[in-house]
Interface confidence: low
């Protein structure tokens, strides 16, 4: 009997080049008679071309939707109604081959060929891509707001914003052949709901999506995206109605950058350079392939790759890597964007060197990848520290904080967060080391106090990279480093001459001269601390809501004591830059730190002075009494305080606090308070300083008010951002 074939719709999208026609501006306007007339002719030609091949029996419909340069490029889609079993056989490559074959067969033919009546189609300029009915629907929804732009070499073209009467717009971008397009998106509003999708082809083909961005991203205020070639499409979908365009788009053609390097590393440890995808920090392009060959000077060394917010993971079952594929010594790894630092350590077993390949396996790409490379000693990868196998990083060992996710850096410690005497492995508290009084049996705590020592968890690193044994030597009035760098940048941490916080007391003017009040429209929102002439530090979560993300909203007050009145010592500033820690995660409160750059430098006075910043190795001993200050609520759920409150709190061991908060306390957090509660920070204190007084009389910033369960509740300590855990980022920004 006769069996009906099951027919399915197969959609193709593509472009062809016409050699005997030239592009004109009229063809960018869909309403123009030139566009209508050219479209009719091109549609006819396309249909005749398809039906001239064996695809003709499957032809269903077609449409030429746009034109471009080159001399004239026609962009089209068509649908074939094909038997289901032929679906795989009629791939875009096969369809392209059939059409090219047809074009070539008539190039020198004198016979009349319908599709050659008006157009001389270049067989080499034909491109056919796989599409879907959904793609065509998406394309059609943008045609009421369709913009074609050709951008020449050396040009940067700023694109006209969307038509706000439309719900969707498409920018069809084209550049010179053999170049690649680089699109720059800059969000200009603090909040919006607009969506932009960038494609590696002329229309919105889902399979050729490079990336999509949504809603005035604060994490990425500027996004640069590379296409694999000279054609790109950008689709805008309307969010909330806005009188302002929430973004600026500009595009420029750029040359292909080779991504192949041969390097020989020097005979030294630490970072020796940077490898990155082309045009970093632009998103890498859909057809990126990098090959880096690194030669190591000796088998004593291994190769370390240090990544920022990106890690390498083994991928199961040969699934494609969605965030970049890496092959290192024939091992296949997949990239993964994370909110942590990461290092890949590659043992070297042969002098031939190491080849590292990076490939974008799919059209979907992501932020450019940059990696610092260098050597490490294979026999001692982390001198004085612990190698965390989970993330490849060197972390402090036995300092009372589990820096490694598996906690192995705090296992098998003879002395945890204390000094181990050489003689008998007795443990003594760190402030007793190099204090002039021998506490170990044979005085080993007072040895080597005037000379350089190997760097370790509690040693202080001088500017010349040498280390000193004395803990917390900064700004104590005695130079301990050979280069005197421990006594530099010491104009900080001194209280002014001075005669909310739950369970606190009112502060006097000049008592906490680094205290800042961060306000929006005259309302105190968060605390902060002055750390340099133009920088105030606070908590990142103060800016969590989109409506709080704009620098324009904020005013910073310094020298303030009373919220409802001003006194001559207080000064105010606008904010010129707001930087959240790149690893800040709202849900976990990790890396809860932000820096505000003031619009002009502070003039120091008795009421306005910066607090001292601790070195990464600074040890704030659990049990130490420190102080928190702020205008936060005086009771849980209460209104903010009019007067600046101060309260002393005790630093809590990390493992104890971690237990209370069910292991949600990360190495970037520090706990303070009391088992009985009562004295604590509260709403409105967020971002304010937790400061501890050194023996020198100077105050050092230990933490920032971050989170906690309620305010002053028994058994629940306050959780603070640990400054020593984020100090390298702070220094990198401020200097």
């Amino acid at each position: 009997g006769y069996k009906a074939e099951v027919m399915v719709s197969q959609v193709y999208s593509g472009s062809l080049r016409v050699l005997n026609r030239h592009f004109s501006q009229d063809l960018t306007r869909r309403e123009s008679s030139a566009f209508r007339s050219e479209t009719a002719k091109a549609q006819k030609m396309l249909k005749e071309l398809i039906t001239s091949t064996r695809l003709g029996t499957y032809y269903n419909s077609s449409s030429v939707y746009s034109f471009g340069e080159g001399p004239l490029t026609c962009f089209f889609w068509f649908i074939l109604q094909i038997p289901e079993h032929r679906r795989l056989m009629l791939s875009p490559e096969v369809v392209q081959a059939l059409l090219v074959e047809e074009l070539l067969s008539t190039v020198n033919s004198s016979a009349a060929v319908p599709y050659r009546a008006e157009y001389e189609v270049d067989p080499e300029g034909l491109v056919i891509l796989e599409a879907s009915v959904k793609d065509i629907a998406a394309l059609n929804s943008t045609l009421g707001c369709y913009r074609y732009s050709y951008v020449g070499q050396g040009q940067v073209l700023r694109l006209k914003g969307p038509d706000h009467l439309a719900s969707s717009c498409l920018w069809h971008l084209q550049g010179p052949k053999d170049l690649m397009l680089k699109l720059r998106l800059e969000w200009t509003l603090a909040e919006c709901r607009d969506r932009l999708a960038m494609y590696d082809v002329a229309g919105p083909l889902e399979k050729r999506l490079i990336t999509s961005v949504y809603g005035c991203s604060r994490q990425e205020p500027v996004v640069e995206v590379l296409a694999s070639g000279a054609i790109m499409a950008v689709v805008w979908k309307k969010g909330l109605h806005s009188y302002y365009d929430p973004f600026v788009l500009s595009v420029q053609p750029v040359v292909f950058q080779a991504c192949e390097v041969n390097l020989t590393l020097d005979n030294r440890l630490d970072s020796q350079g940077v490898l990155s995808t082309p045009y970093f920090p632009s998103y890498y392009s859909p057809q990126t392939h990098c090959s880096w060959h690194l030669t190591v000077p000796s088998l004593d060394y291994g190769l370390a790759l240090w990544f920022d917010a990106y890690a390498l993971r083994r991928q199961k079952y040969d699934l494609p890597c969605t965030q970049g594929q890496w092959t290192i010594q024939n091992r296949r790894l997949c990239g993964l964007r994370i909110l942590q630092p990461y290092a890949e350590r590659i043992p070297v077993v042969a002098t031939a060197g190491i080849t590292i390949n990076f490939t974008s396996q799919i059209s979907l790409t992501g932020p450019g990848v940059r990696v610092h490379y260098g050597l490490y000693n294979q026999s001692d990868p982390c001198p004085g520290e612990f190698l965390c196998s989970v993330n490849g990083l060197c972390v402090p060992a036995c300092d009372g904080v589990k820096d490694c996710p598996n906690g192995l850096d705090e296992r098998n410690c003879v002395c945890r967060a204390t000094f181990q005497c050489k003689e008998d492995s007795t443990c003594i508290s760190l402030p007793k080391v190099c204090d002039g009084q021998p506490d170990c049996l044979n005085g080993s705590d007072e040895e080597q106090c005037q000379e350089g020592v190997p760097c370790g968890t509690f040693t202080f690193q001088c500017e010349d990279r040498s280390c000193v044994k004395k803990p917390n030597p900064q700004c104590d009035g005695r130079p301990d480093c050979r280069d005197g760098s421990d006594e530099e940048h010491c104009d900080c941490g001194l209280q002014g001459p001075s005669s909310r916080i739950v369970g606190g007391a009112v502060s006097s003017e000049g008592e906490w001269p680094w205290q800042a009040s961060l306000q929006v429209r005259g309302r105190h929102i968060c605390g902060g601390a002055l750390i340099a002439d133009r920088w105030v530090i606070t908590a990142a979560h103060c800016f969590q809501e989109d409506s709080m993300a704009s620098t324009v909203l904020w005013t910073v007050f310094l020298g303030k004591v009373w919220q409802n009145s001003r006194w001559p010592g207080e000064v105010s500033f606008k904010v010129s830059r707001l930087l959240l820690h790149p690893y800040h995660e709202e849900d976990s409160h990790d890396y809860d730190v932000a820096l505000l750059q003031l619009d002009h430098p502070v003039v120091r006075s008795a009421a306005v002075r910066p607090v001292c910043l601790p070195a990464r190795s600074h040890f704030f001993e659990p049990g130490l009494h420190c102080w928190i200050t702020g205008w936060g609520a005086l009771r849980e759920g209460g209104p903010i305080s009019n007067a600046l409150q101060k309260v002393d709190v005790q630093l809590i061991p990390q493992d104890l606090c971690s237990e209370v908060y069910r292991y949600q306390v990360t190495p970037r957090m520090l706990c303070a308070g009391y088992r009985k509660g009562k004295k604590d920070a509260c709403q409105g204190d967020s971002g304010g300083p937790l400061v501890c007084k050194a023996l020198s009389g100077r105050w050092f910033l230990a933490g920032l008010v971050s989170w906690g369960l309620g305010c002053g509740r028994p058994n629940y300590f306050g959780v603070y951002t640990r400054i020593t855990g984020v100090i390298s980022w702070i220094q990198q920004v401020v200097t």
């Epitope: 700023r158 006209k160 600026v248 324009v552």
Partner: antibody, heavy 122, light 108 residues
């Protein structure tokens, strides 16, 4: 009510430097929303944009005048200034300062000073 | 250098409609703006973003955009509308401000 007021000498000798100041009242020049610009109009002719600046000190200039022009800001006085070096008679014009809305795709002047005539003559 | 082209003059009788055009290659990618300038006075913005009217500008002023041309339309022209009209935009990169040469509108 925003007001802009240009001030400076009405007569400048050829080859000297023309200096003008614009005093802004009714809005802070340090507002993050606006740029501030200078435009000139030779007698009987059209408008020509000279350049614009942001309160932070960022500037950009008309390419044809770039080599001779400097725009600077004094946020404490809520003023911005224009200097044009090596003037000739062709620089004789009414000079306007204006608030420049240069936000997103927008790029226009929504408030202007009343203008001041500067004549270049020996 | 990049230029915006305007007709030098347009004449119209009171109550009629006046149309002033401004053309340039970058206008499909950049917005157009219109200013009115009366003798001895500073320019006043009458249309922004091709077709939007600032508050305080009469409804008879409107703007439109088509391809490489923006148009200022004054319907029901009044004697007080006699003035010079300047269009303004930016070059194709969006970097530099450019003014048209101006059009003198005469109300007959």
């Amino acid at each position: 009510q925003l007001q802009l007021q240009e001030s400076g000498p009405g007569l400048v000798k050829p080859s000297e430097t023309l200096s003008l100041t614009c005093t802004v009242s009714g809005d802070s020049i340090s507002s993050h929303t606006y740029w501030w610009g200078w435009i000139r109009q030779p007698p009987g002719k059209g408008l020509e944009w000279i350049g614009s600046m942001f309160y932070s000190g960022s500037t950009y200039y008309n390419p044809s005048l770039k080599s001779r022009v400097v725009i600077s800001v004094d946020t404490s006085r809520n003023q911005f200034s224009l200097k044009v070096r090596s003037v000739t008679a062709a620089d004789t014009a009414v000079f306007y300062c204006a608030r420049h809305n240069n936000w997103g795709m927008e790029n226009y002047f929504d408030d202007w000073g009343q203008g001041t005539l500067v004549t270049v003559s020996s | 250098s990049y230029a915006l082209t305007q007709p030098p003059s347009v004449s119209v009788s009171p109550g009629q409609t006046a149309r002033i055009t401004c053309s340039a290659d970058a206008l499909p990618d950049q917005y157009g703006y219109w200013y009115q300038q009366k003798p001895g006075q500073a320019p006043v913005l009458v249309i922004y973003k091709d077709s939007e009217r600032p508050s305080g500008i009469p409804e008879r002023f409107s703007g439109s955009s088509s391809g490489t041309t923006v148009t200022l339309t004054i319907s029901g022209v009044q004697a007080e509308d006699e003035a010079d009209y300047y269009c303004q935009s930016a070059d194709s990169s969006g970097s530099y401000v450019v003014f048209g040469g101006g059009t003198k509108l005469t109300v007959l």
